[in-house]
Interface confidence: low
C-alpha cells in the first residue's frame, strides 16, 4: 500500500530513508536535456523475497536531441518547482539497515539522472530526520517518521524534532550540548510523490540525533 502523502515537514530539517521497503518505487527521472529511452522503465521497484531484496528495472536516459516519442507520464524535474528538493550527493550504503529483510539499499546512480530522486513510499517505511547545515537539534532522542495505516488511511507519525540556528539557541532553556548535523530538505505536506536526496548520514546518526516537540499534523 502506497503512502498517500509525504513525510512530515520539519522546519530546517531534512529526511532520509536508510533502506527502502519492498514495494517502494523510484521514478526514472532524467536531468535537463535528457529523457527516458523509448523502451525504458518509468520507475524502479524494490522487490524480493524473504532472503533478498533488490531494485527491479533499470532507469536509462538518452539525449532529448534524439527523436523519442515516449509519453512522459511523470513530470520532468523542471516542472517540479513546487516540490522542495535538495541536490543529489554521492550515494551512500548505510551498513546498519541496508541488510534488513524486505528492504532495498539506496539505488545506484544511473547515467544522466535528475538531480533529485522522487520516491513513492509504502506503509511501514521509516525515514530519519536531521537538521540542515547551520542549524542544530535540541535534545537527544529518535527523530524518525513511519508511514502507518490507520482506519484505512495512511499517515506518517510525527518526528519529535526542532532545529534551531546558532543565533537562536539562547532562547531555549535547558538544552543539551548538541553535535553538528548535515544537509537539508524543505517542504510539502500534501503531495503523493516524495523527493529526497542522498545526503551523508553517519551510521551513528540515531545516537547523535537530538530532538524536541512540535508537530505539524495529526497522526
Amino acid at each position: 500500500e502506497l503512502c498517500d502523502d509525504d513525510p512530515p515537514e520539519i522546519p530546517h530539517a531534512t529526511f532520509k530513508a536508510m533502506a527502502y521497503k519492498e514495494g517502494t518505487m523510484l521514478n526514472c527521472e532524467c536531468k535537463r536535456g535528457f529523457r527516458r529511452i523509448k523502451s525504458g522503465s518509468l520507475y524502479m521497484l524494490c522487490t524480493g523475497n524473504s532472503s533478498h531484496s533488490s531494485w527491479d528495472n533499470q532507469c536509462q536516459c538518452t539525449s532529448s536531441a534524439t527523436r523519442n516519442t515516449t509519453k512522459q507520464v511523470t513530470p520532468q524535474p523542471e516542472e517540479q518547482k513546487e516540490r522542495k528538493t535538495t541536490e543529489m550527493q554521492s550515494p551512500m550504503q548505510p551498513v546498519d539497515q541496508a541488510s534488513l529483510p524486505g528492504h532495498c539499499r539506496e539505488p545506484p546512480p544511473w547515467e544522466n539522472e535528475a538531480t533529485e530522486r522522487i520516491y513513492h513510499f509504502v506503509v511501514g517505511q521509516m525515514v530519519y530526520y536531521q537538521c540542515v547545515q547551520g542549524y542544530r537539534a535540541l535534545h537527544r532522542g529518535p527523530a524518525e517518521s513511519v508511514c502507518k495505516m490507520t482506519h484505512g488511511k495512511t499517515r506518517w507519525t510525527q518526528p519529535q524534532l526542532i532545529c534551531t540556528g546558532e543565533m537562536e539557541t539562547s532562547q531555549f532553556p535547558g538544552e543539551e550540548k548538541p553535535q553538528a548535523s548535515p544537509e537539508g530538505r524543505p517542504e510539502s505536506e500534501t503531495s503523493c510523490l516524495v523527493t529526497t536526496t542522498d545526503f551523508q548520514i553517519q551510521t551513528e546518526m540515531a545516537a547523535t540525533m537530538e530532538t524536541s516537540i512540535f508537530t505539524t499534523e495529526y497522526q
Epitope: E9, P11, H12, G141, Q158, Q160, F172, E187, T215, Y218
Partner: antibody, heavy 116, light 107 residues
Framework: EVQLVESGGGLVQPGRSMKLSCAAS????????MAWVRQAPKKGLEWVAY????????YYRDSVKGRFTISRDNAKSTLYLQIDSLRSEDTATYYC?????????WGQGVMVTVSS | DIQMTQSPSFLSASVGDRVTINCKAS??????VNWYQQKLGEAPRRLIY???SLQTGIPSRFSGSGSGTDYTLTISSLQPEDVATYFC?????????FGGGTKLELK
C-alpha cells in the same frame, strides 16, 4: 472526535498561583506534543508553552519563563499549566492545543483574570 | 522574534466578494505559515497550513499563497458564515508568532 476541555481558571489576585488543566479525549494523547496558547481580552494570540509527547522537553516564551510550568500526565490524558507569581498581564483566555506549532485542535479555552 | 504584520486590520465586504488578507513576516519564514479563523466567542480553527494546504473539512473557497516574507489568505466568494477574525502564524522559528488579526465583517 477530538475533545480538549480546559478547567481551573477564574479570578485570582496578583502574586498568587493557579493550575490549569486540559482533559483530552478522542485521540492518542501520549503520541502528541501539546501546547498552551493565550489570548488577552480583545487582543491577539500568543503561544505560551509547549511540551513534547513524552513530557521530557518543554519550551516557554520569554515573558513567562520561570513562572509558568507546563506538564502532562499521559496516563490520565491530561495537560497542565502551573502559573506562579501571577501578573495583571497574564489575564487572558488560555487555550489547550494539540499538534504543536500547527494548533491543529483547540479547546474552548478557560478565562484567567488577575486582579486585586 | 519574527513579527507577523497583518493587513488590513479591519475589512468590510459583501457576500460573493473576493477577499484577500495579507501577512508580512519580518524575515523569511520559508512558507511555514498557518492561517486561522476565529469566530466571536469561539476558539480559533486552522484553515490553511504550510502556506497553501487546505485543512480537512475547510471549504475550498479558502486558499493560501505566498513565499519568503509575504503571504496571503484568499476567500474566493465571501459567505455570511465567514464573518470572523483571521490570524496568520509562522512556525519557521521559535517562538512561533501570530499576526495581529484581521476582523472581517459584512457590508
Amino acid at each position: 472526535e477530538v475533545q480538549l476541555v480546559e478547567s481551573g481558571g477564574g479570578l485570582v489576585q496578583p502574586g498568587r498561583s493557579m493550575k490549569l488543566s486540559c482533559a483530552a479525549s478522542g485521540f492518542t494523547f501520549s503520541n502528541h506534543a501539546m501546547a498552551w496558547v493565550r489570548q488577552a481580552p480583545k487582543k491577539g494570540l500568543e503561544w505560551v508553552a509547549y511540551i513534547s509527547y513524552d513530557g521530557d522537553n518543554t519550551y516557554y516564551r520569554d515573558s513567562v519563563k520561570g513562572r509558568f510550568t507546563i506538564s502532562r500526565d499521559n496516563a490520565k490524558s491530561t495537560l497542565y499549566l502551573q502559573i506562579d507569581s501571577l501578573r495583571s498581564e497574564d489575564t487572558a483566555t488560555y487555550y489547550c492545543t494539540t499538534g504543536g506549532n500547527s494548533g491543529y485542535d483547540w479547546g474552548q479555552g478557560v478565562m484567567v483574570t488577575v486582579s486585586s | 522574534d519574527i513579527q507577523m504584520t497583518q493587513s488590513p486590520s479591519f475589512l468590510s465586504a459583501s457576500v460573493g466578494d473576493r477577499v484577500t488578507i495579507n501577512c508580512k513576516a519580518s524575515q523569511n519564514v520559508n512558507k511555514f505559515v498557518n492561517w486561522y479563523q476565529q469566530k466571536l466567542g469561539e476558539a480559533p480553527r486552522r484553515l490553511i497550513y504550510g502556506t497553501n494546504s487546505l485543512q480537512t473539512g475547510i471549504p475550498s473557497r479558502f486558499s493560501g499563497s505566498g513565499s519568503g516574507t509575504d503571504y496571503t489568505l484568499t476567500i474566493s466568494s465571501l459567505q455570511p458564515e465567514d464573518v470572523a477574525t483571521y490570524f496568520c502564524q509562522q512556525y519557521s522559528s521559535w517562538p512561533w508568532t501570530f499576526g495581529g488579526g484581521t476582523k472581517l465583517e459584512l457590508k
